[in-house]
């Protein structure tokens, strides 16, 4: 066991050395290790296949350390690896696309609060387990098309607080399973009409404190399980304009936010899904 | 540590508009995703929440309001305002800002609370 | 009329330890997290609990909150002279998207 850790067999065979003032990843862990815990160090680079040994590994935290670099084959050989976190490594900033792949059991991923300027093609490549995607907080500027397309079991996909102006069509291909999209703040101005087509199973949609001053309703009509919508703190422009999202709030059985116009002038502040549709007049 | 200053007239005429101020000091307004929030009390009662304008310049009203309330955010003042027209006697309260803070949980649960406070103003609608 | 309820008042001794019950329904307290505030006399309120539970810093540890189904509640353990005040919680509802809040208790250090 390396001397700043602790190693443990019950109720797994774990390897823990979180918040030791690590500045590398330990040689000598052992390659039984089921669980790696390395958080709260000062790590900062991840070298190719660190962790090879160990090849019964299911959960590695590597989160709230100072990483910049991981090498493409650093996780090479995990191939039971289940949880991996890689959150609050804000001088990160890009993953290689290669990184991830093999990991064909992974089922929760953290890269959240890591500086991510962008998803590089393929990054999520084979992932087909995996479940839970936090990409919050992070400066993320667009969404590549087919970006998430293997990952046909996900059921929660955070984006919140990015930087992201749209959704395009392919955005969110392949995401048959999602159940929670949360998007809110970020700058979206555009969302395609098609761009939530594959998401007959969502149930949660966040896309609050954006730049939306409409939304076509042709994007909700495919999300069939949709129950929680949030759309407020947006610059809603409440004329003839909103009428089909007027309309389609006034169907909608789910639980939906105020959606408050920001103009006209006259109707700032108040709740479109509470007016008329005489209200809704001038374009 | 932010902070928040009310200012405004403790004295308003029957049909006339109240206009308070709150400046907001050990932040910049526009920084963070926030709600700069108005709430009220009558004189021993409970509060009565009126509206919000977001860091990002979008207000939201109390509908119970109707078309009287108005909240708008001056970035270079480091202030927010709230303006009531055609106020009457029921509108004699005092007036608090505060600031809305939310929080994303691990589970995509929204977390939101009022904190901190500004010290409040009595308004009395008279003639 | 506050759309959540809470009782009127609420008294105990020093070092006692008293608690509050804050009802609402489906659309509030049932599918939001519920905050509480206290309100000393001729002051301005203060967050006391936020997220159902948590504690901003200041906040002594013996006040705490739970939530289940479309009830919350507030506990004061070890009651003391200081704690005396009018206690509110709030929560937002998802039906009339507003942040409502109860009446108010008011708790009586004997």
């Known amino acids: 066991c390396p001397g700043a850790c602790v190693c443990y067999n019950e109720p797994k065979v774990t390897t823990s050395c979180p918040q030791q003032g690590l500045q590398a990843v330990p040689v000598g862990i052992p390659a039984a290790s089921q669980r790696i815990f390395l958080h709260g160090n000062r790590i900062s680079h991840v070298p190719a296949a660190s962790f090879r040994a160990c090849r019964n590994l299911t959960i590695l935290w590597l989160h709230s350390n100072v990483l910049a670099r991981i090498d493409a084959a650093a996780f090479t050989g995990l191939a039971l690896l289940e949880q991996l976190d890689l959150s609050d490594n804000a001088q990160l900033r890009s993953v290689d696309p290669a990184t991830f792949h093999g990991l064909g059991r992974l089922h929760t991923l953290h890269l959240d609060r890591c500086g991510l300027q962008e998803l590089g093609p393929g990054l999520f490549r084979g992932l087909a387990a995996l479940q839970y995607l936090y990409l919050q907080d992070n400066a993320l500027q667009a969404l590549p098309d087919d970006t998430f397309r293997d990952l046909g079991n996900l059921t929660h996909l955070f984006l919140h607080g990015n930087r992201i102006s749209s959704v395009p069509e392919r955005a969110f291909r392949g995401l048959h399973s999602l159940d929670r999209l949360l998007l809110h703040q970020n700058r979206v101005a555009h969302v395609h009409p098609h761009a939530f087509r594959d998401l007959g199973r969502l149930m949660t949609l966040y896309l609050f404190a954006n730049n939306l001053s409409a939304l076509p309703t042709e994007a909700l009509a495919p999300l069939r399980a949709l129950q929680y919508l949030r759309l407020n703190d947006n610059p809603w422009v409440c004329d003839c304009r909103a009428r089909p999202l007027w309309a389609w709030l006034q169907k909608f059985r789910g639980s939906s936010s105020e959606v408050p116009c920001s103009l006209p002038q006259r109707l700032a502040g108040r709740d479109l899904k509470r007016l008329a549709a005489n209200d809704l007049q001038g374009c | 540590q932010v902070q928040l200053q009310q200012s405004g007239p403790g004295l308003v005429r029957p049909s006339q508009t109240l206009s308070l101020a709150c400046t907001v000091s050990g932040d910049s307004i526009s920084s963070g995703d926030y709600y700069w929030t108005w709430i009220r009390q009558h004189p021993g009662k409970g509060l009565e929440w009126i509206g919000y304008?977001?860091?990002?310049?979008?207000?939201y009203y109390n509908p119970s309001f109707m078309n009287r309330v108005a909240i708008s955010i001056d970035s270079s003042k480091n202030q927010f305002s709230l303006n009531l027209s055609s106020v009457t006697a029921a509108d004699t309260a005092v007036y608090y800002c505060?600031?809305?803070?939310?929080?994303?949980?691990?589970?995509?649960?929204?977390?939101?609370?009022?904190?901190?406070w500004g010290q409040g103003t009595l308004v009395t609608v008279s003639s | 009329q506050a759309v959540l309820t809470q009782p009127s008042s609420a008294s105990g001794t020093p070092g006692q330890r008293v608690s509050i019950s804050c009802s609402g329904s489906?659309?509030?307290?049932?599918?939001?997290?519920v905050n509480w505030y206290q309100q000393l006399p001729g002051t301005a309120p203060k967050l006391l609990i936020y997220s159902g539970n948590q504690r901003p810093s200041g906040v002594p540890d013996r006040f705490s909150g739970s939530k289940s189904g479309t009830s919350a509640s507030l506990a004061i353990s070890g009651l003391q002279s200081e704690d005396e005040a009018d206690y509110y919680c709030?929560?937002?509802?998802?039906?009339?998207?507003?942040?409502?809040f109860g009446p108010g208790t008011k708790v009586t250090v004997l």
């Open positions: 709030a929560a937002w509802d998802d039906s009339l998207n507003n942040l409502v």
């Open positions: 304008i977001s860091t990002r310049g979008s207000p």
């Open positions: 489906s659309s509030n307290i049932g599918s939001n997290t």
């Open positions: 505060t600031r809305e803070t939310q929080h994303t949980s691990i589970f995509g649960v929204i977390h939101n609370w009022l904190d901190p």
